[in-house]
Interface confidence: low
């Protein structure tokens, strides 16, 4: 889960090291803050949880890249 | 906090160039390179990660031609090769946010003319 | 690419007034990260808004980002004589293509 140090940065401090399903995510963020000590990617859940990914992790690029296209994808 | 570029220079067609950006503090987010020709708009160049993995991401048409490179904890520099008058701009250099989507901090550019 | 298309090019407008400024996006941007700029000759950019209607720290309230999707604005209210300058709009695509758009520019004139 990641930390607000103080109001504008969040960080990520661990990542999780289990595989996220991407039907369960709704969106990302990523954290490119000095002010943290890792470059981290936020996935928030369709519960609205939010979680710490390492971004050189392949799922994690896929699942980014996964809700780059559903955005694309007008919703009907 | 403040950011300063350095390099620019008159140069002729099919030279190449170093630009130097240079960060008050060691603790710098993400830099990146703009630049806007002579009363154009703005156009990204390419971005480099201050954390230790040093990251790159380059615009489409820059890949190649355009290297940014992290060479101390406080400067980065974007190196240019064979150059044209179309490249002729003043080259800005920005950090990121928090996030990697905008700009909060810009050095003031530094002009480069490609001209023979 | 992410192609920013901005309009009007150049507006004018009187002290107190209202100036809106648009910009759409070729494809969606994720997340809204949006972000507007402003610029005055021989200075570089200032950072406005972020994330379609974030205020940026420092920027006077007058200043207001809206939108979502493809289509955002930015309206300047009680337009002031230092408001005069070039405003852009940035888009910022995303992982799978990253690359930042801005849009042409809009110069606002006050009068």
């Known amino acids: 889960q990641p930390d607000a140090i103080n109001a504008a940065v969040t960080c990520c401090y661990n990542f999780t090291n289990r595989k996220i399903s991407v039907q369960r995510l709704a969106s990302y963020r990523r954290i490119t803050s000095s002010k943290c000590p890792k470059e981290a990617v936020i996935f928030k859940t369709i519960v609205a949880k939010e979680i710490c990914a390492d971004p050189k992790q392949k799922w994690v690029q896929d699942s980014m890249d996964h809700l780059d296209k559903q955005t694309q994808t007008p919703k009907t | 906090q403040s950011l300063e570029e350095s390099g620019g220079d008159l140069v002729k067609p099919g030279a190449s160039l170093t630009l130097t950006c240079t960060a008050s503090?060691?603790?710098?987010?993400?830099i990146c390179w703009v630049r806007q020709a002579p009363g154009k708009g703005l156009e990204w160049i390419a971005c480099?990660?201050?954390?230790?993995?040093?990251?790159t991401y380059y615009a489409s048409w820059a890949k190649g031609r355009f290297t940014v490179s992290k060479t101390s904890s406080t400067t980065v520099t974007l190196q240019m090769t064979s150059l044209t008058a179309a490249d002729t701009a003043t080259y800005f250099c920005?950090?990121?946010?928090?996030?990697?989507?905008?700009?909060?901090?810009w050095g003031p550019g530094t002009l480069v003319t490609v001209s023979s | 690419a992410l192609v920013m298309t901005q309009t009007p090019s150049s507006v004018s407008a009187a002290v107190g007034g209202t100036v809106t400024i648009n910009c759409q996006a070729s494809q969606s941007v994720y997340n809204n990260n949006m972000a507007w700029y402003q610029q005055k000759p021989g200075q570089p950019p200032k950072l406005l808004i972020y994330?379609?209607?974030s205020l940026a720290s420092g920027v006077p309230s007058h200043f207001r980002g809206s939108g979502s999707g493809t289509q955002f604005t930015l309206t300047i209210s009680d337009l002031e004589s230092d408001d005069a300058a070039t405003y852009y709009c940035a888009g910022y695509k995303s992982y799978s293509n990253d690359e930042y758009g801005f849009g042409g520019g809009t110069e606002v004139v006050v009068k």
């Open positions: 503090e060691l603790d710098f987010y993400w």
């Open positions: 480099i990660g201050a954390g230790s993995s040093g990251s």
């Open positions: 994330t379609a209607s």
């Open positions: 920005a950090r990121t946010g928090t996030e990697f989507t905008y700009y909060s901090l």
